[in-house]
């Protein structure tokens, strides 16, 4: 099982829009995918994926949760509020039909005050 | 470029231990999300899949060889080894090993293949 | 284990004419939680290794002639070459990554007649 994370670095406005990709790939197939973004160490949801649908589609303040056939969970904020910075990481384990689990690297998130006097300008970049 | 290279004795006695070891050039079998694979042919061309090695030292085998298959690896050399026990004639093939990703899951790339033969 | 069956086991055929290969599973391959087919093809060329030819059923491997297609979804694949070539002379082998162990068919030979 492998998960890959992006980006690595995410700088929005508040009130905005942020958009978390976790990409889950596995050789084999599975029947059920458990996985979880936490924000700084605390879980902010931890459904599960079975027959192509997530168990739930909120995570955490403002998060929606989707999966796009075959591989792809997005975790997007909206709007984002000041307290959404931190350090997101995506985990998926396989549950069926054999245990095996990994995480992403860490998603920084920053959110900008909406005053554009404070507005410090970051790059947002993906793992190559 | 990515190259495996089997190696190992070409004959072997019944009873005794098969032991093949696969080199691996080119990319690290560190690299997270790979799996490395033996296979083999047997004399009328049927492919077996024996078991691989993943990443995280994580081992599967196939139930048919029961107990008598083991795969390690050696990451200080970039190698991963079977060694397969009890061998009689029956186990006489071509040794294959191969790579997968979890990004796909096909063998994408294989060793050249070395016989074995098992007789005294 | 998953059971994969080729028909036919020898496939003569003349250079310029088409050629297809069956593979039948006796389970499904197809994941409704990836939308994939876990169904490859190889083909084994004489004194060479096995060479990805398609991947998840219907996907041409990097390098590999157009005039080769694979289709089918589920338990029932097909492989296709819409012209043979003499260098397409080999085994020709399906192979199921759905679950361990990973199986293989028994192998289509195709000949130039």
């Known amino acids: 099982l492998s998960v890959q994370q992006g980006p690595n670095l995410l700088q929005v406005r508040q009130g905005s829009q942020a958009t978390l990709v976790c990409q889950v790939d596995q050789a084999t197939a599975w029947e059920r995918l458990r996985v979880k973004w936490t924000k700084d160490g605390a879980i902010l949801c931890q459904p599960y994926i079975t027959n192509g649908s997530l168990s739930l589609g909120v995570c955490g303040p403002q998060g929606r949760l989707s999966w796009q056939a075959p591989s792809h969970l997005t975790l997007q904020l909206d709007p984002v509020s000041l307290n959404h910075s931190g350090a997101y990481v995506c985990w998926a384990a396989v549950e069926i039909p054999e245990l095996e689990e990994a995480e992403g690297n860490i998603t920084r998130l920053f959110v900008d005050p909406d005053d554009p006097t404070q507005n410090r300008n970051r790059i947002a970049s993906f793992p190559g | 470029q990515v190259q495996l290279q089997e190696s190992g004795p070409g004959l072997v006695k019944p009873s005794q231990t098969l032991s093949l070891t696969c080199t691996v050039s080119g990319f690290s079998i560190t690299t997270g999300g790979y799996y490395w694979n033996w296979i083999r042919q047997f004399p009328g061309k049927k492919l077996e899949w024996m078991g691989y090695i993943y990443t995280s030292g994580r081992t599967s085998y196939n139930p048919s060889l029961k107990s008598r298959v083991t795969i390690s690896r050696d990451t200080s050399k970039n190698q991963f080894s079977l060694k397969l026990s009890s061998v009689t004639a029956a186990d006489t093939a071509v040794y294959y090993c191969a790579d997968m990703a979890d990004k796909g899951g096909w063998f994408a790339y294989w060793g050249q293949g070395t016989l074995v033969t098992v007789s005294s | 284990d998953i059971v994969m069956t080729q028909t036919p086991l020898s496939l003569p055929v003349t250079p310029g004419e088409p050629a297809s290969i069956s593979c039948r599973s006796s389970q499904s391959l197809f994941s409704s939680n990836t939308k994939r087919n876990y169904l490859d093809w190889y083909l084994q060329k004489p004194g060479q290794s096995p060479q990805l030819l398609i991947y998840h059923a219907s996907y041409r491997a990097s390098g590999v002639p157009d005039r080769f297609s694979g289709s089918g979804s589920g338990t029932d694949f097909t492989l296709k070459i819409s012209r043979v070539e003499a260098e397409d002379v080999g085994v020709y082998y399906c192979?199921?990554?759905?679950?361990?162990?990973?199986?293989f068919g028994q192998g289509t030979r195709l000949e130039i007649k």
């Open positions: 192979q199921q990554h759905y679950e361990t162990p990973l199986t």
